[in-house]
Amino acid sequence: GELETSDVVTVVLGQDAKLPCFYRGDPDEQVGQVAWARVDPNEGIRELALLHSKYGLHVNPAYEDRVEQPPPPRDPLDGSVLLRNAVQADEGEYECRVSTFPAGSFQARMRLRVLVPPLPSLNPGPPLEEGQGLTLAASCTAEGSPAPSVTWDTEVKGTQSSRSFTHPRSAAVTSEFHLVPSRSMNGQPLTCVVSHPGLLQDRRITHTLQVAFLAEASVRGLEDQNLWQVGREGATLKCLSEGQPPPKYNWTRLDGPLPSGVRVKGDTLGFPPLTTEHSGVYVCHVSNELSSRDSQVTVEVLDPEDPGKQVDLVSAS
């Protein structure tokens, strides 16, 4: 006869471990008992449980309610047991000793491996600003047993670096993702991917990149000279810029206050029916938490009744 077991039994923390021990012998052989023990290099052999063909299962008080036999129907020569709710301290070597009649005793050892799945955490780096050099975008840490794998999944160009710390029963892995911030990265996902044998599928944590920037400002609205004549309605100046965080807009007139009737609506300056008093230098001031930009334009409103004057529109930034 011989014993059938597994060299290694792998179980996830908190699950039940099946410790297999099958006796393959002649049908007329009887299994008297199966003794299960924990083999510790320091503490020696410690009994877990005894499965007796006549008296049933006896469990060491230290493992009370944690060791059980699977319910019937069971092969009478099956000495497998279940170790409930495996913890890291259960990791180690186990021995199954089968006493048979008339063939005698057989023993086999196996190693129980308890996987501790990681609970990853992602920490964003300092605020990203366009114009910075290589900057930490995010770091991702996962601790488990064995050491988890931590990688990054993103379309963004950058560099990753990992370091690990080994603890007595686990290992922590931290991976950092560095990049040179640019506005094109705004809203792009940066995903930390954690792989581990104790996970059914990879764990993924996504961080959305935010890069602070402010684009140059420019003013639109002077392209059609016919709009800027006395009496015309609907003339507007629009300030063009973009930024993160979204910028605020402010309109002023360089050579005095804004004329009455001129309305400011965010990035747009709306004019009432035009008069020559609307001529002047207008300044758009764009700002966010990162920076500010200005753009100015000179508007001259032509009076068609005054033939000596040509339309003269000058734009300057």
């Epitope: 099946k18 099958f22 393959r24 699977p70 319910p71 092969d75 009478p76």
Partner: antibody, heavy 118, light 107 residues
Framework: QVQLKQSGPNLVQPSQSLSITCTVS????????AHWVRQSPGKGLEWLGV???????DYNAAFMSRLSITKDNSKSQVFFKMNSLQADDTAIYYC????????????WGQGTSVTVSS | DFQVTQSPASLSASVGETVTITCRTS??????LAWYQQKQGKSPQLLVY???TLADGVPSRFSGSGSGTQYSLKINSLQPEDFGTYYC?????????FGGGTKLEIK
């Protein structure tokens, strides 16, 4: 290689018994036991019972009173007998070898299609 | 009474796709679960035992997973020969019931 060949009737009268023989080759019945399973259109796959390598048996409680599984190791044969058949026992009956894990069915017979009718 | 619920009852997929079939049990069965494939007019064939161990000769595109009361069979990159009906079966307490089956049709 491992084979399980079944032999038995295809037609059984109501209230009569059904006997099927499963002859195995490629392994010993002293090393691996055998299951019996049936498949009917109405009930899908149904586990009926098992004979262990040591000769002891376990039956599905629903069939315990009318089912018997025995074997002859020297002839490499497993015998299935079910009494008091009715129309709803019409099914395909399979024998299957117990696998390396001690429970799953890793090789199956070709099946015996049994109709219970007068 | 002990229940084994298999889902879906049927599914249709294309060659190359990945499919997953699930079995739920009414109590913890501690990985005492097997998966079988059956083709029309043929006997079932063992694919996976002990919830996760691939039977001899079964292609690696098949994989079993799960624990406790929930188990899955995954088939990566479906092949034309994978059509048929799939069953799970538990071996925890009597009777060792089968799931109701999942009929997999190739689109």
């Amino acid at each position: 290689q491992v084979q399980l060949k079944q032999s038995g009737p295809n037609l059984v009268q109501p209230s009569q018994s059904l006997s099927i023989t499963c002859t195995v080759s490629g392994f010993s019945l002293t090393t691996y036991g055998a299951h019996w399973v049936r498949q009917s259109p109405g009930k899908g796959l149904e586990w009926l019972g098992v004979i262990w390598r040591g000769g002891s048996t376990d039956y599905n409680a629903a069939f315990m009173s009318r089912l018997s599984i025995t074997k002859d190791n020297s002839k490499s044969q497993v015998f299935f007998k079910m009494n008091s058949l009715q129309a709803d026992d019409t099914a395909i009956y399979y024998c299957a070898k117990i696998g390396y894990d001690g429970y799953a069915m890793d090789n199956w017979g070709q099946g015996t299609s049994v109709t219970v009718s007068s | 009474d002990f229940q084994v619920t298999q889902s879906p009852a049927s599914l249709s997929a294309s060659v190359g796709e990945t499919v997953t079939i699930t079995c739920r049990t009414s109590e913890n069965i501690h990985n005492y679960l097997a998966w079988y494939q059956q083709k029309q007019g043929k006997s079932p064939q063992l694919l996976v035992y002990n919830a996760k161990t691939l039977a001899d000769g079964v292609p690696s595109r098949f994989s079993g997973s799960g624990s406790g009361t929930q188990y899955s069979l995954k088939i990566n990159s479906l092949q034309p020969e994978d059509f048929g009906t799939y069953y799970c079966q538990h071996f925890w307490s009597s009777p060792w019931t089968f799931g109701g089956g999942t009929k997999l049709e190739i689109k």
